[in-house]
């Protein structure tokens, strides 16, 4: 009880005049505060609390929620207390089942006794289970029994206050803790898609996937360098009791040019915050960008394979390609695919398999392609190699010796003149005509050369050479000559 | 003791606007997820729109989404709802909600409700 | 959206008999995140049950709650004058939030 200083207030005096007060329930509490400048009584237990403006309070009858703490107040402010248990075989606990704990925090049970003298007053679990080993806690008959540091793991747990009375233990209603967990990460964030094309008008929709321990981490859609709030709708699940799930959804109704760039989806929790981005890229019309993966003028050997390979940017996606050669559309021998299976993939591959190519099927090979706004092409010239083929080879009534070669490219005819029987020619002879015979005709194919030489000049018997030759290899063609006396009596031309 | 005390309810024409108050007292606000609930007369409850304690999660039901918005204010204890292009089919009792300590959605404390009336 | 149906709309019996009604969802309700409201006339409802079993503080335990996935039971082993309610599921598992259309349980 409180001494008295003589000049400052003191607090009241409480009779009778202890700290603790046994009563056994049926009995009466009395209580008397002692002070001139008297206010009120207060009593308080679990929540609850009651007030008396009597300087005595009276129970008559004593139940055992009566138990807790009465505190006499006066004028000053200045107050003394004291704490009555209520003795009640039948009822050795009062329990407010509540029970609700923050984690890495202690928290109370709050089962305070009726009788301060039973033994072992601790907590057990529910049905005979045992309690979590690490499960640490401090028993306060007055309070109840504190849990400390709550763990994850004890959410949803199912215990009882316990005691021994009398050589018996009793056990308290059950309580289940509930635990909000602490945050001990940043939020996971991830957009259903890295970035968006879309052409004026269409609607732009983006989902921001946010997971967290609880409901509360904070989200939010925000653009890149702007403070405009933007209009986003959220979904959220509880997959489990620490594993909740929100999505957040951006969505702009008629997208416009204007609205192109970034989009960021934050998201934080008292531990610290993430991010990520999506980028909007938004067209007044779709478009059609083709790129050769070869040269567009392709030279190939006769009887080998080319491939004619495009990639092409399409958007909105390519509806008609095709391969094209002399107004003919191919079939087959072609294959078109996307370059990734990416849900945003623009960008296409389309491949021709010329196979086994004839020096007649050079030409000018289109690959046209369109979608819903666009269309485009690309040509690809293709010139086959072809060894040169001697066409004719003749003596003319002038007496010249004529020569005409075809191949691609254009053949060099050159003439040797071999003294006697011999096929190995060396000495060379100038050609008196050579022209190419279809330099104005189509663009591709082979080209046609006549090459002539006088064959007056040649005043011994022997053979004369024509070869013809080119990048891709050599034909030769040979006439015989044969002198009787001053004539020339026999020419025979042969390969 | 917790308590939630709505307001602001009251008869309204079509397409006309009002403000729902919820005060709440009697725990600490700010670490609550809150939710409105209506219930059209003689009618079954209907979830309207959920706010997070830190106000970083909104949700509204199909049938509000675009006029009614819900926020909260953790310093004077109040949650509201903003009713704009009121409809007949919005006349109802609406009922703020507290959702329990570690758990949104589940709501273990209701106030008694203020009756909105959307009428010409 | 989850859709809650509860059936039967009405129940009618005598005090003292066991009282079951039904809730079933249109899909699965994970971690049983699914709850039972009591609604008396002229008052706001009031949490019997959650987490599909657990009786929430100060609730009698005549009370009772059972199911998992779809299906779910709210049991009321005796029935009292004072239990005259209609009585709510609701699911917390995902928005939105959806209520069943209610059991409204009278005394025969």
């Known amino acids: 009880q409180p001494s008295v200083s003589p000049g400052e207030p003191s607090p009241p005096s409480i009779h009778p005049a202890k700290s603790e007060l046994i009563v056994r329930v049926g009995n009466e509490i009395r209580l008397l505060c002692i002070d001139p400048g008297f206010v009120k009584w207060t009593f308080e237990i679990l929540d609850e609390t009651n007030e008396n403006k009597q300087n005595e309070w009276i129970t008559e009858k004593a139940e055992a929620t009566n138990t807790g703490k009465y505190t006499c107040t006066n004028k000053h402010g200045l107050s003394s207390s004291i704490y009555v248990f209520v003795r009640d075989p039948a009822k050795l606990f009062l329990v407010d089942r509540s029970l609700y704990g923050k984690e890495d925090n202690d928290t109370l049970v709050r089962c305070p006794l009726t009788d301060p003298e039973v033994t072992s007053y601790s907590l057990k679990g529910c049905q005979g289970k045992p309690l979590p080993k690490d499960l640490r806690f401090v028993p306060d008959p007055k309070a109840g029994i504190t849990i400390k540091s709550v763990k994850r793991a004890y959410h949803r747990l199912c215990l009882h206050c316990s005691a021994d009375q009398e050589g018996k233990s009793v056990l308290s209603d059950k309580f289940i803790l509930k635990v909000r967990p602490a945050f001990k990460a940043v939020p996971v964030v991830s957009v259903s898609k890295a970035s968006y094309l879309l052409r004026e008008g269409e609607e732009f929709t983006v989902t921001c996937t946010i997971k967290d321990v609880s409901s509360s981490v904070y989200s939010t859609w925000k653009r890149e360098n702007s403070q405009t709030k933007l209009q986003e709708k959220y979904n959220s699940w509880h997959h489990g009791d620490f594993n909740y799930e929100r999505q957040a959804t951006l969505t702009i109704s008629s997208a416009r040019v204007n609205d192109s760039g970034v989009f960021m989806c934050y998201a934080n929790n008292t531990f610290g915050s993430a991010n990520v981005t999506t980028t909007l890229e938004v067209v007044d019309k779709g478009f059609i960008n083709i790129f050769p993966m070869i040269n567009t003028t392709v030279f190939v050997n006769d009887g080998e394979n080319v491939d004619l390979i495009v990639e092409y940017e399409a958007f909105p996606k390519p509806e008609h390609q095709q391969w094209i050669y002399m107004n003919r559309t191919f079939t087959d021998k072609w294959e078109d695919y996307p370059k990734s299976e990416n849900e945003s993939n623009i960008r296409y591959v389309s491949e021709l398999h010329l196979t086994r190519l004839k020096g007649t099927e050079g030409g000018t090979y289109t690959f046209l392609v369109s979608n819903s706004d666009v269309n485009a092409s690309i040509a690809f010239n293709v010139y086959v190699n072809t060894k040169p083929e001697i066409l004719t080879y003749d003596r003319l009534v002038n007496g010249m010796l004529q020569c005409v070669a075809a191949g691609f490219p254009e053949p060099t005819i050159d003439w040797y003149f071999c003294p006697g029987t011999e096929q190995r020619c060396s000495a060379s002879v100038l050609p008196v005509d050579v022209q190419t015979l279809n330099a104005s005709g189509p663009p591709f194919g082979k080209l046609v050369v006549q090459s002539s030489i006088d064959s007056s000049a040649f005043k011994h018997n022997g053979t004369v050479e024509c070869k013809a030759y080119n990048d891709v290899g050599k034909t030769s063609a040979y006439f015989n000559f044969a002198f009787k006396g001053n004539n020339k009596e026999q020419i025979h031309p042969h390969t | 003791e917790v308590q939630l005390l709505e307001s602001g309810g009251g008869l309204v024409q079509p397409g006309g606007s009002l403000r729902l108050s919820c005060a709440a007292s009697?725990?600490?606000?700010?670490?609550?997820?809150m939710s409105w609930v209506r219930q059209a007369p003689g009618k079954g409850l209907e979830w309207v729109s959920a706010i997070g304690y830190g106000g970083g999660g909104k949700y509204y039901a199909d049938s509000v989404k675009g006029r009614f918005t819900i926020s909260r204010d953790n310093s004077k204890n109040t949650l509201y709802l903003q009713m704009n292009s009121l409809r007949a089919e919005d006349t109802a009792v609406y009922y703020c909600?507290?959702?329990?300590?570690?758990?949104?959605?589940?709501?273990?404390?209701w106030g008694q409700g203020t009756l909105v009336t959307v009428s010409s | 959206e989850i859709v809650l149906t509860q059936s039967p709309g009405t129940l009618s019996l005598s005090p003292g008999k066991r009282a079951t009604l039904s809730c079933r969802a249109s899909q699965s309700v994970s971690n049983s995140y699914l709850a039972w409201y009591q609604q008396k006339p002229g008052q706001p409802p009031k949490l019997l049950i959650y987490?599909?079993?657990t009786r929430e503080s100060g609730v009698p335990d005549r009370f009772s709650g059972s199911g998992s996935g779809t299906d779910f039971t709210l049991t009321i082993s005796s029935l009292q004058a004072e239990d005259v309610a209609v009585y709510y599921c609701q699911q917390y598992y995902s928005t939105p939030l959806t209520f069943g259309g209610g059991t409204k349980v009278e005394i025969k």
């Open positions: 987490w599909a079993s």
């Open positions: 909600a507290k959702d329990t300590w570690w758990l949104a959605g589940l709501f273990d404390y």
């Open positions: 009697g725990f600490t606000f700010s670490d609550y997820g």
